[in-house]
């Protein structure tokens, strides 16, 4: 479907199938020049760029990140910009395109054999970084699931909740996303009050399991508004 | 071919609750946005919530918010809507929709009618 | 939040005709605009997104121009199932919006 048309390297970034994995089947790819637009179950070429807005990175497709498109970061509306290759510079992981994280300012390889380890310790070093957080919004980070053959297991790096075996869901962790479990009834979840307050979260609880909401847990109703606590009650 | 299943809609009284389901098939669930859209009898669309791919990001309007819940389920390849809290405001015809991207409405089911009413 | 409002609300044409149909901002949503054809008893379609470019199976009729606050939706040649309610949406910000609707009648 609408892939973004609205990016500046929308090819790159179309949904599969051309991408391999997922998508609308039965797509027909245009081979001309110029970004390319799902539309319907056809892919028509568009010739004009487009930006897309967004609020945070999730909004952008996994071959962009969400910033400010001038250096001085106005107060204008933020942009899916394309991802950084490697060796180019970066702020956080989500910012270096599929298969690379942010180490030290630079985009890496994300070599399977030394990811771990390495994300680990680059989590560390940017942990407290005011550049690390330099657009106050939520992180994705830009890992390829395709060096993931098997469902991540709770602790492994993920891009989004299918990458996750059964019961966990993909939520931020410092800077990176992990499979984390599904929130079970009675635990404490976070409900969001206003628009953007997720991307603030630096540990990042799953949602509520099938068939919960997040709540305000009934004894803590009289509390003041900063103290409610929520946590996951049957529908 | 994609198609977009809602259900759950009925009468319910003011105060009441109730939750929508929309069934999606024909496409990876997983890898899209979902949306409710709704439409008062007679009247034009309002955009109600929308839910990312893995279910982290979640946007509501204000008329709905604290009232409803959107969630997902990508291993069953449903989209929810719990509204609680309901209010004769609230009658209208509920479409799910899905796109690509995060503000789009790309691809629309064919929508359930909730009536709010004593 | 980013008001929409179309004009006119609804207009009687005969098959043939040029159509336009308005939409206006309450501030500056750039190109970031959306136009849905929603038909009696059916869910909408997309018709244009990012302000002038057709999904595939949309036909060439159909376009969109402007920027800024100001936009149109031309139908250049009115066609017995172009008869629908149009609606246009802002995604230049959340929460997003719709405008009113514009219904085309056959006069």
């Known amino acids: 479907t609408l892939n973004s048309v609205l990016n500046s390297n929308a090819i790159k970034n179309l949904p599969p199938p051309l991408g391999g994995a997922a998508g609308h089947p039965g797509s027909a790819v245009s081979a001309a020049p110029g970004i390319l637009y799902p539309g319907g179950n056809k892919y028509q070429t568009i010739d004009n760029y487009q930006p897309y807005p967004c609020a945070e990175d999730e909004e952008c497709g996994t071959d962009e990140y969400c910033a400010s498109p001038t250096r001085g970061g106005d107060a204008g509306v933020q942009i899916c910009l394309a991802c950084r290759k490697r060796r180019k510079r970066c702020m956080r992981h989500a910012m270096c395109c599929p298969g690379n994280y942010c180490k030290n300012g630079i985009c890496v390889s994300s070599d399977q054999n030394h990811f771990r380890g390495e994300i680990e310790e680059t989590i560390t070093e940017s942990f407290g970084n005011d550049h690390s957080t330099l657009d106050g919004y939520s992180r994705r980070t830009t890992l390829s699931s395709k060096m993931y053959h098997t469902k991540g297991q709770e602790g492994s790096v993920c891009l989004r909740s299918s990458d996750c075996a059964s019961g966990l869901c993909c939520a931020r962790h410092f800077w990176s996303k992990i499979c984390k479990p599904v929130l079970k009834e009675g635990q404490v979840c976070t409900k969001h009050r206003r628009k953007g307050s997720h991307g603030l979260e630096i540990f990042q609880r799953c949602y509520c399991g099938e068939g919960l909401s997040c709540r305000i847990q009934k004894d803590h109703h009289q509390a003041s508004n900063s103290s409610r606590l929520h946590t996951c009650q049957r529908h | 071919e994609v198609q977009l299943l809602e259900s759950g809609g009925g009468l319910v009284q003011p105060g009441g609750s109730l939750r929508l389901s929309c069934a999606a098939s024909?496409?990876?669930?997983?890898?899209?946005?979902n949306h409710w859209v709704r439409q008062a009898p007679g009247k034009g669309l309002e955009w109600v919530s929308t839910?990312?791919?893995?279910?982290?990001?979640?946007y509501y309007a204000d008329s709905v918010k604290g009232r409803f819940t959107i969630s997902r389920d990508n291993s069953k390849n449903t989209l929810y809507l719990q509204m609680n809290s309901l209010r004769a405001e609230d009658t209208a015809v509920y479409y799910c929709?899905?796109?690509?991207?995060?503000?789009?409405?790309?691809?629309w089911g064919q929508g359930t009618l909730v009536t709010v009413s004593s | 939040d980013i008001q929409m409002t179309q004009s006119p609300s609804s207009l009687s044409a005969s098959v043939g005709d040029r159509v336009t149909i308005t939409c206006r901002a309450t501030?500056?949503?750039?190109?970031?605009l959306n136009w849905y054809q929603q038909k009696p008893g059916k869910a909408p379609k997309l018709l244009i997104y990012?302000?002038?470019n057709r999904p595939s199976g949309v036909p060439s009729r159909f376009s969109g121009s402007g920027s800024g606050i100001d936009f149109t939706l031309t139908i250049s040649s009115l066609q017995p199932e172009d008869f629908a309610t149009y609606y246009c949406?802002?995604?230049?910000?959340?929460?997003?919006?719709f405008g009113q609707g514009t219904k085309v009648e056959i006069k």
């Open positions: 990012g302000q002038h």
């Open positions: 839910i990312g791919p893995s279910g982290t990001s979640t």
């Open positions: 929709a899905e796109s690509f991207r995060s503000r789009y409405f790309d691809y």
């Open positions: 949406q802002q995604y230049y910000d959340w929460p997003l919006t």
């Open positions: 501030q500056s949503i750039r190109s970031f």
């Open positions: 024909g496409f990876t669930f997983s890898s899209y946005w």
